[in-house]
Interface confidence: medium
């Protein structure tokens, strides 16, 4: 271009459809200059105008020659320019914020603007820059980019921003600008100008001075508090911790808390202090609800479902901020809400859900929700498999007969389609418990009944019951215990009977033992004793319990004695015993020794003995009839241990083994014995029968059985020189070599001659008896031999 011709042609577009081209006028031209602008290769491509810019339709790709003729008073000048889209700048129109609003409760700004997309021919990406400024000094807080797309229509755009500082704390300004990133445009792209600024500020009321108020926040978050004050704020505390003040407009201040700690249930206090006042708020720092743990559902009665769960990690939020729970069943669409009043039991929460007719499968979702978030747990449950029956109530026991009872109880619920497995605990006094399992068909009316047999008559039982469904999920709790005495039955056996002749041989004394409770089958009231021979049967009068003995005058003929026990129901089978013994001439008295507590008796098997064996025992020193006690053992036995609390060590007892056939008893063995042998309690009495110059004849007596305290095994005779009333007197002093001892093992020997003695010498004699239980005390004597003649 020549100097003095139009120069510096530049073109811009704000919508890609129209280019706005402008140039600088030739130097020296005044106002009245006209221009002719011609665009090469265009029909009607010349334009007359009076200003230095022209709007032309956007040119398609390629180079275009633009001729500008300037017509003015001094003549004309022409300039030629080459114009290409690449030389054009795309500068969007300045955007305008249509609306800026705020939600002060959430400290959120809401922005609304129009993209004026209808003026653009193509879809284009748009980048928006949004600038947030704070305080009167317009400090930049946030610069964000936001992407949208132009779609040929005017589109309203919304954008929101949550402020880290409550919006009440300071004025907030917002500006926007845009950049159109059109793929169809090859020229330079530039940012629009910033929009006119919009602002949001809070109109203070007289009450609230500190923001935010009663905020619920996630533990570990950062949060800003501020105090709107006319007076100077001196300090700020969160809990007991001082915080540095951040100055805002006027006297307003803020504090920033980083990584906030969990609050107590009453929240955490935030306090601002001025000279005259204290202003504050409460913050609740907690957690969103944890996923409900161990959600499980069961039913007690097939009418109502009980769902239990553990809330998991505590949220630290209570009251209106606590977690609320909703249990939704997805097949039916029904739901129930957890009421906060229903405080958790042992850390576990529970909800009841009414069962639905004909629905067995339930798909439960438990939703947990609090101000910080929500979570959920799901469970699919076949409720017929998850029955946890109530504790059986109204548990009753009724007699059927003496060995069977009827148990009845109440188990609330409609169990018509289900079977129960019930466990009955049967406890007899002083014995171990028995458990019986019974399967029972479930009913609609909650009343159940079962018969229990194989019990003992006249026995105190304690019953209790628990139930589960037969598929078993959980046992119910045990019912209350019920104590019950079964009814009496006739005694199952006759009494254990024995007989002895009186010492004068004229009377037969019949003894019997009380029946054990499991054979008595009731309270024994009396006994009937009868005696029969081939000719006659004679009955004694009824003998009331607890008398267990009767005496009958009998001759020595053979009689059968019968003893019958009676209770309120009836009589036992008779116990029979013959009055006379079956003779046995081939008997020797044997010695037996026990084992401290009892005595073991053994014998050879005898096939002739068909009823039983009887072992009878008595104290040897007692007068006739000899009977302390007896024991019956079965006929196939060949040994028994006899034990009794009456047995004493060192006491001699007589033991008799009888064998029985046809109710008659034959004495098979006669024994004397001790449970335990002791040493004799006395020494034998002895005397000197004869003395010579070189010998002494000593004679002694038997020790009585009571003092012997064991089987006599021998005597120890000690002798040595010794005089009465001297220190050399003690024969048994140890270390004396001149003392002689004679062990006499022939217990029938009652005399002893001591020879080879010295004449006219004093001798000390000592005699002791011994058993297997030890050596008895000593008896001593001093004897002087005669003088040698």
């Amino acid at each position: 271009q020549k100097k003095g011709a139009p120069h510096d042609l530049k073109c811009v577009t704000n919508n890609l459809q129209v280019w706005d081209c402008y140039w600088k006028a030739p130097s020296g031209t005044g106002r009245g200059t006209d221009y002719e602008v011609c665009i090469e290769n265009r029909s009607h491509s010349c334009y007359q105008l009076e200003k230095t810019n022209i709007k032309i339709p956007a040119l398609s790709h390629g180079d275009y020659e633009i001729t500008i003729n300037s017509l003015h008073d001094f003549g004309s000048s022409t300039s030629k320019f080459t114009l290409n889209e690449q030389n054009v700048s795309l500068i969007p129109d300045t955007p305008e914020i249509l609306n800026l609003s705020a939600d002060f409760s959430t400290s959120t700004l809401y922005l609304k603007w129009n993209d004026r997309g209808s003026v653009f021919p193509h879809h284009s990406n748009v980048i928006w820059e949004i600038k947030i400024l704070r305080k009167e000094s317009m400090e930049l807080v946030k610069l964000v980019t936001h992407n949208t797309t132009l779609n040929g229509k005017d589109t309203l755009h919304h954008w929101s921003w949550a402020s880290d500082m409550p919006l009440e704390c300071a004025i907030h300004f917002v500006e926007i600008r845009c950049y159109i990133d059109s793929l169809h445009f090859s020229g330079r792209k530039e940012w629009s100008d910033w929009s006119p600024v919009k602002n949001i500020s809070w109109m203070p009321d007289s009450q609230t001075k500190v923001f935010p108020q009663d905020k619920v926040i996630l533990v570990g978050s950062d949060i800003t508090f501020c105090c709107i004050s006319q007076e100077k704020v001196l300090s700020a505390l969160i809990g007991h911790t001082n915080c540095p003040l951040i100055h805002l407009d006027g006297e307003n201040v803020a504090i920033k808390i980083h990584n906030i700690s969990v609050s107590a249930s009453s929240g955490t206090n935030v306090v601002f202090t001025t000279e005259d006042n204290i202003f504050g708020t409460v913050i609740f720092a907690g957690y969103p609800p944890d996923t409900p743990q161990q959600l499980n559902c069961e039913t007690h009665d097939l009418k109502e479902i009980l769902c239990r769960w553990n809330p998991g990690r505590a949220t630290a939020l209570v009251g209106p901020r606590a977690t609320s729970y909703t249990l939704l069943e997805s097949f039916s669409g029904k739901y129930v809400r957890f009421k906060r009043a229903e405080a958790p039991t042992n850390g576990s929460y529970q909800l009841f859900f009414q069962m639905l007719p004909n629905q067995e499968i339930y798909n439960f979702t438990l939703n947990a929700h609090n101000p910080l978030g929500r979570s959920e747990s799901t469970i699919l449950v076949n409720i017929t498999e998850k029955v946890y029956p109530h504790t059986p109530t109204s548990f009753k026991v009724k007699d059927i007969n003496s060995t069977a009872v009827k148990l009845s109880w109440h188990l609330p619920g409609n169990f018509a389609k289900i079977n129960f497995l019930c466990q009955i605990e049967i406890k007899k006094s002083n014995t171990v418990q028995e458990q019986r399992n019974v399967t029972i068909k479930g009913v609609e009316n909650s009343s159940y009944l079962v018969a229990l047999d194989k019990l003992n008559p006249y026995t105190v039982y304690t019953f209790r019951i628990r139930c589960s469904t037969e598929t078993f999920w959980k046992w119910s709790k045990w019912s209350n215990k019920k104590q019950h005495l079964t009814t009496e039955a006739i005694p199952s056996k006759g009494p254990d009977t024995w007989r002895e002749w009186s010492s004068d041989g004229k009377n037969l004394i019949i003894y019997w033992k009380p029946l054990p409770i499991n054979e008595a089958n009731g309270k024994i009231l009396s006994y009937n004793v009868s005696c029969s021979s081939d000719e006659e049967t004679q009955s004694l009068s009824e003998i009331p319990d607890p008398q267990h003995k009767a005496e009958i005058q009998l001759d020595k003929n053979d009689y059968i004695i019968s003893v019958v026990a009676k209770n309120s129901v009836g009589s036992s089978p008779p116990s029979k015993i013959a009055s006379m013994e079956i003779p046995n001439d081939d008997l020797k008295i044997e010695q037996v020794v026990g084992m401290g507590k009892g005595i073991l008796l053994t014998w050879h098997y005898d096939p002739n003995m068909t009823c039983d064996y009887v072992i009878k025992w008595c104290n040897s020193s007692r007068s006739e009839p000899c009977l302390m006690d007896w024991r019956k053992v079965p006929s196939n036995s060949t040994e028994t241990v006899i034990e009794s609390d009456q047995f004493r060590p060192g006491v001699r007892y007589n033991f008799f083994l009888y064998g029985c056939r046809n109710q008659g008893y034959q004495l098979l063995r006669s024994m004397i014995g001790y449970i335990e042998e002791l040493a004799p309690t006395v020494a034998p009495n002895f005397t000197v029968e004869d003395t010579s110059a070189d010998s002494i004849l000593v004679k002694w007596e038997d020790i009585p059985v009571e003092e012997l305290r064991g089987f006599l095994r021998g005597y120890l005779f000690y002798f040595g020189k010794g005089e009465r009333d001297t220190s050399k007197m003690r024969v048994l002093e140890s270390g004396r070599s001149d003392i002689k001892v004679k062990n006499i093992t022939d217990i029938s020997q009652k005399t002893l001659r001591i020879a080879d003695l010295q004449g006219k010498t004093s001798y000390h004699l000592v005699l002791r008896a011994y058993t297997d239980g030890g050596v008895g005390p000593e008896k001593s004597m001093y004897v002087v031999t005669k003088e040698n003649s």
Partner: antibody, heavy 116, light 110 residues
């Protein structure tokens, strides 16, 4: 998605021990009873053991009683089977399966071979 | 222990056939019975529970019936995807023997 994944199988000598794991995902593990079921090569299914949702009840087949122990860690969504004193007849594919009784979700199984 | 006897052990059939498998319990198990399908190399899949209830997502051609000790499982019209082994399982009680499965029935192509 809802699934069970077993691991821990392998070849082991008779008398030795092995521990199987089963990791659950996609459902609330702590709300369900869990089983181990095994299948010897070419044979049918053989139930081994079950544990209640909260670990309160455990039941075992007679053939493994006293040797195998089932346990669970609800915080890790994991079921375990501790197998001691292993025998040749314990050789099988071991599956973990969800449910106290009806087994509505099964893992792909882990193979245990007991051989000297 | 409750024993489960399944019959037949193998069954040959053609696509479109109606197929029935039976399962007998050694003592009454009410309706506590499930049926499973297992394909080679795969885990079993629950089809029927409580003797006759169809598991969610299982085609209606599968059905079950019976109670007490006698149970049957029917595929009304056999499809190519149904060739597999089928097991019954009682779940009445864990005590003394626990859950028990039948020996299985292999349904193969005739």
């Amino acid at each position: 998605q809802v699934q069970l994944v077993e691991s821990g199988g392998g070849v082991v000598q008779p008398g030795r021990s092995l521990r199987l794991s089963c990791v659950a995902s996609g459902f609330t593990f702590s709300s369900y009873g869990m089983n181990w079921v095994r299948q010897a090569p070419g044979k049918g299914l053989d139930w081994v053991t079950v544990i209640w949702f909260d670990g309160s009840n455990k039941y075992y087949a007679d053939s493994v009683k006293g040797r195998f122990t089932i346990s669970r860690d609800n915080s890790k969504n994991t079921l375990y089977l501790q197998m001691n004193s292993l025998r040749a007849e314990d050789t099988a594919m071991y599956y973990c399966a969800r449910g106290e009784r009806t087994l509505d979700l099964w893992g792909q199984g882990t193979l245990v071979t007991v051989s000297s | 222990d409750i024993q489960m006897t399944q019959s037949p052990s193998t069954l040959s059939a053609s696509v479109g056939d109606r197929v029935t498998i039976t399962c007998r319990a050694s003592q009454s198990i009410s309706s506590w019975l499930a049926w499973y399908q297992q394909k080679p190399g795969k885990a079993p899949k629950l089809l029927i529970y409580k003797a006759s209830s169809l598991e969610s997502g299982v085609p209606s051609r599968f059905s079950g019936s019976g109670s007490g000790t006698e149970f049957s499982f029917t595929i009304s019209s056999l499809q190519p995807d149904d060739f597999a082994t089928y097991y019954c399982q009682q779940y009445k009680s864990f005590s003394p023997g626990g859950l028990t499965f039948g020996g299985g029935t292999k349904v193969e192509i005739k």
